[in-house]
């Protein structure tokens, strides 16, 4: 380090900034000698407000250092980012955002939930960091499957729904009326035949939610960003793989009247056995043969798959047959069914363990004579499509 040039003046002894130290420490510093400044953990080199990773000054011929000593300033992670559908609390103190400060993220209660504990600490690298070492924001995921509806097993014609009974119910308006089910704050599950031809003409698809009255002027509007129809669905050639997903342009805010339906857990099959009761809602044709003004629902039992397949071989539906990708529901004697205009809506079941409702079926097809004896409603079997659904959502 020492280069003695007697023609030059020594430089003044450098003074370490608070929370920092200088290296090397020498008795004198002459031409071309240098020193570096190092800050202790949790502090950073700042020249004014501009951060530096390292600092070295060199002694010049005129006996001055070539640059001024920076400060060692406490790391400031800055104000934490806003959490969509949540908020942040300062734990260490009001607005304290410096090294080792703690903040707590939480989601809007009732309607959103967080998988992590939401606690973040301002670390030495200047980033808010979770206990798992994550620097990205936690996610407030919508709660799913909460409903004010209690399944009473009423096996009669439709009943009018009450607010909060079917908050996942989505009204699809195009050339015809159809339905869908919200399964995330920006994804709608529906029947492929209900949105067929809409992949390009998406602007013609009007998506409404948070309503009971079909013609209500007060509703939450959503528009499609993309429509995904199952690649195994062939329009006009039966209803196998009658499933589609609509990606919404914007996330909808979850509340008691707009909430996703849960996707079935692996154990769901045990809750959808023959004679187990599900519930379907819609604005489709009623007994009177007109679209319902108010959202209606019916509680219907699942029908033995073989019995349903046999019924539809006796009284065939043109071009359709019951496949393993379908489940049937209804009464042997008829009288309770979904109908045209209900297509794409969810057949839901209560998971007694979680006390949440999940989607087991999507209204797909059935006899022209809705609710006829041994003319069961046929639904797309959602459990067969969980990988397909997750693949599309995760890769969008």
């Amino acid at each position: 380090h020492h280069h003695h040039h007697h023609a030059s003046q020594p430089c003044p002894d450098p003074t370490a900034p608070p929370n920092g130290h200088i290296s090397p420490v020498q008795a004198t510093y002459v031409l071309k000698d240098s020193f570096s400044v190092f800050c202790k953990t949790g502090f950073e080199l700042l020249q004014g407000s501009v951060p530096l990773k390292s600092f070295t000054a060199v002694c010049q011929k005129d006996g001055s250092w070539d640059r001024p000593i920076p400060e060692c300033s406490i790391i400031d992670c800055g104000p934490p980012d806003d959490l969509p559908n949540g908020h942040v609390d300062y734990i260490t103190g009001p607005e304290v955002t410096t090294y080792k400060a703690v903040i707590q993220y939480s989601c809007e209660e009732t309607f959103y939930t967080m998988s992590s504990n939401g606690k973040y600490v301002c670390e030495a690298d200047g980033f808010w960091t979770s206990s798992k070492g994550e620097k990205s924001l936690p996610v407030c995921k919508p709660v799913c499957g909460l409903s004010t509806h209690t399944s009473g097993g009423r096996i009669i014609g439709g009943q009018p729904a009450k607010p909060g009974d079917f908050p996942w119910q989505v009204l699809l308006l195009g050339e015809t009326t159809a339905a869908g089910a919200l399964i995330h704050d920006d994804w709608v599950l529906t029947a492929a035949h209900a949105v067929y031809g809409k992949t390009e003409a998406m602007s013609s698809l009007d998506i409404r939610m948070g309503i009971l009255k079909r013609l209500s002027l007060i509703y939450t509007q959503a528009w499609p960003e993309a429509v995904f129809i199952h690649e195994g669905y062939t329009h006009g050639a039966g209803f196998d793989n009658d499933i589609a997903l609509i990606k919404l342009k914007n996330k909808v805010t979850i509340n008691r009247n707009i909430m996703p339906i849960c996707l079935p857990r692996k154990e769901a099959a045990s809750l959808m056995k023959t004679d187990f009761v599900g519930t379907v809602a819609g604005w489709g044709l009623t007994q009177k043969g007109f679209l319902a003004r108010n959202l209606m629902f019916v509680d219907i039992p699942i029908v033995d798959h073989q019995k349903c397949a046999t019924a539809y071989t006796k009284q065939p539906y043109p071009g359709a047959k019951v496949t393993v990708n379908m489940l049937c529901a209804g009464l042997d004697r008829g009288g309770k069914d979904s109908c045209r205009g209900d297509a794409g809506g969810a057949l839901v079941f209560l998971d007694n363990e979680t006390q949440r409702w999940f989607v087991g079926g999507i209204v797909s097809w059935g006899s022209i004579n809705c609710g006829g004896s041994e003319q069961y409603g046929v639904y797309t079997k959602v459990t067969n499509y969980i990988p397909w659904i997750e693949n599309i959502i995760n890769n969008f």
Partner: antibody
Framework: DVQLQESGPGLVKPSQSLSLTCTVT?????????WNWIRQFSGDKLEWMGY???????SYNPSLKSRISITRDTSKNQFFLHLSSVTTEDTATYFC???????WGHGTTLTVSS | DSVMTQSQKFMSTSVGDRVSVTCKAS??????VAWFQQKPGQSPKGLIY???YRSSGVPDRFTGSGSGTDFTLTISNVQSEDLAEYFC?????????FGGGTKLEVK
């Protein structure tokens, strides 16, 4: 020798988003310093927009905070300016610069017009 | 925000003269001030940082001084190539702020 070079679209319509790239040669953006975006309006007024530091931390001008984002691609030694909802007021020459301004790019002119 | 005021928009000088460009900060900015020279059609060039430290390659006729709120860029023995606009910048606190510029005209 340290060199900075801005690139961008030149013309953007109002309400659209703007993305500019600063490519740095002769020095790694993760080695040290803060890497700034600065713009100059037609009357010669200069405005500091924000920086991304060697560590990846960012600081923005509060006047732009809701619209601005500065990111980087360390593998390409580039940093980026993203500005949303542009208006004709964002018409300017955009510069990238290092540290306090010891090195600057040549600038790229942006016009916001329908 | 610290407002940087360059009260003289234009200054006129002759080759060989000494000229001082001033900049006033609305708040104490310590010595965290830089000076830039910008010629028409070019990007700004750093001359001085930390109020008085000359950037490498800058002729020693350019000197900076001041601290706190008052800062001066002095050009002794002005040359014709010094015809340019000069800006000050404070980088003491965010947001960094520039002065409005002073155009130097060489007679």
């Amino acid at each position: 020798d340290v060199q900075l070079q801005e690139s961008g679209p030149g013309l953007v319509k109002p309400s659209q988003s703007l993305s500019l790239t600063c490519t740095v040669t002769g020095y790694s953006i993760t080695s040290d310093y803060a890497w700034n975006w600065i713009r100059q309006f037609s009357g010669d007024k200069l405005e500091w927009m924000g920086y991304i530091s060697y560590s990846g931390s960012t600081s923005y001008n509060p006047s732009l905070k809701s619209r601005i984002s500065i990111t980087r691609d360390t593998s390409k030694n580039q940093f980026f300016l993203h500005l949303s909802s542009v208006t004709t007021e964002d018409t300017a020459t955009y510069f990238c610069a290092r540290y306090w301004g010891d090195y600057w790019g040549h600038g790229t002119t942006l016009t916001v017009s329908s | 925000d610290s407002v940087m005021t360059q009260s003289q928009k234009f200054m006129s000088t002759s080759v060989g003269d000494r000229v001082s460009v001033t900049c006033k900060a609305s708040h104490n900015v310590g010595t965290n001030v830089a000076w830039f020279q910008q010629k028409p059609g070019q990007s700004p060039k750093g001359l001085i940082y930390s109020a008085s430290y000359r950037s490498s390659g800058v002729p020693d006729r350019f000197t900076g001084s001041g601290s706190g709120t008052d800062f001066t860029l002095t050009i002794s023995n002005v040359q014709s190539e010094d015809l340019a606009e000069y800006f000050c910048l404070q980088y003491n606190s965010n947001p960094l702020t520039f002065g409005g510029g002073t155009k130097l005209e060489v007679k």
